[in-house]
């Protein structure tokens, strides 16, 4: 793995310390030849959760074009999920022209959908 990246189960992970909007975080990872983290198992969930701590952190999951999609093409419907109860609620009340379209880890590790412009931390992943 590159310097400052963490290797785990044939992938490399980079954990941000600053905060960015989802699109900016997504772009950051792409410029590093990586993508926002795609969580495919409970074991990977626990690994990421251990490194990010109790801070809202973007992952590579969004529904900005309709259905929920992982940025690397991993199938959402059949894949691992760890939403908080009653999430995602894709709440349309905020008048942004869409719902809460981007997914993040919450303080307890479970997932929530939120306004994509929020300045949260993020995790990049690239496969070895």
């Amino acid at each position: 793995c590159p310097v400052n990246w963490v290797e785990h189960e044939r992938s490399c992970y980079w954990f941000s310390r600053s905060g960015k909007a989802w699109a900016d975080a997504d772009n950051y990872c792409r410029l590093e030849d990586a993508h926002l983290v795609v969580v495919t198992s409970w074991e990977e969930q626990k690994f990421v959760q251990h490194h990010i701590g109790p801070v809202n952190t973007w992952m590579g999951l969004h529904d900005q074009n309709g259905p929920w999609k992982w940025v690397d093409g991993t199938d959402y419907e059949t894949g691992f999920k760890n939403w908080r109860p009653e999430q995602p609620d894709d709440w349309y009340g905020h008048g942004l022209g869409g719902g809460e379209d981007c997914a993040h880890f919450t303080d307890d590790g479970r997932w929530n959908d939120d306004v994509c412009q929020r300045p949260y931390r993020w995790v990049c992943e690239t496969e070895l």
Partner: antibody, heavy 120, light 107 residues
């Protein structure tokens, strides 16, 4: 009880520097983001800067970017604002305020403020 | 940056009146809006966050509503201690921005 006490204000000439401090007590300082907000005489509130709970993320208003630096010492429960190249328009009451969370959740508790006057 | 338009800039009201202050943002901010009260020579005091959630210790005569770009602060029955300046603030993203304030004066 939760308390924030600012200090370090005073009269300073344009172009000079000043360092403000904010002493926090009554809560676990290291788990909260902290902000500086200022208010020019007779004017409204202007957000200045934020630092996340662990010091890793800092953001500034465009009006102070490159001149002001926010910092914190979690071992001393202290927030600081280093102000360089001061201008007349920096004259204001400066408040430190606690974030409701790690740094992106809005403000809940405010200090009483310290006055900075930039004048020749 | 997100611009905050608060109205009215000032209003005169009597004790017991119902007062409504509005805040409009230049782009949608979800519910990431707070309201503050400031009295002359004093620090601001937080009243509401997430558009409608009361801060601890704040009386229920204060209420907030709205989402997206349009928000309101309502004081159901104005009391002498409520005469002050009120500010809205968005915290959806940096830089945080405040409205220009609404001064509530005694009629």
């Amino acid at each position: 009880q939760v308390q924030l006490v600012e200090s370090g204000g005073g009269v300073v000439q344009p172009g000079r520097s000043l360092k403000l401090s904010c002493a926090a007590s009554g809560f676990t300082f290291s788990t909260y983001g902290m902000h500086w907000v200022r208010q020019a005489p007779g004017k409204g509130l202007e957000w200045v800067a934020v630092i996340w709970y662990d010091g890793t993320n800092k953001n500034y208003a465009d009006s102070v970017k490159g001149r002001f630096t926010i910092s914190r010492d979690n071992s001393k429960n202290t927030l600081c604002l280093q102000m360089n190249s001061l201008r007349a328009e920096d004259t204001a009451v400066y408040y430190c305020a606690r974030d409701q969370g790690v740094g992106y959740d809005g403000l809940d508790v405010w200090g009483q403020g310290t006055t900075v006057t930039v004048s020749s | 940056d997100i611009q905050m338009a608060q109205s009215p800039s000032s209003l005169s009201a009597s004790v017991g009146d119902r007062v409504t202050i509005t805040c409009r943002t230049s782009q949608g901010i979800g519910k990431y809006l707070a309201w503050f009260q400031q009295k002359p020579g004093k620090a601001p005091k937080s009243l509401l966050y997430k558009a409608s959630s009361l801060q601890g210790g704040v009386p229920s005569k204060f209420s907030g509503s709205g989402s997206g770009t349009d928000f309101t602060l309502t004081i159901s029955s104005l009391q002498p201690e409520d005469f002050a300046t009120y500010y809205c603030q968005q915290y959806m993203t940096y830089p945080l921005t405040f409205g220009g304030g609404t001064k509530v004066e005694i009629k």
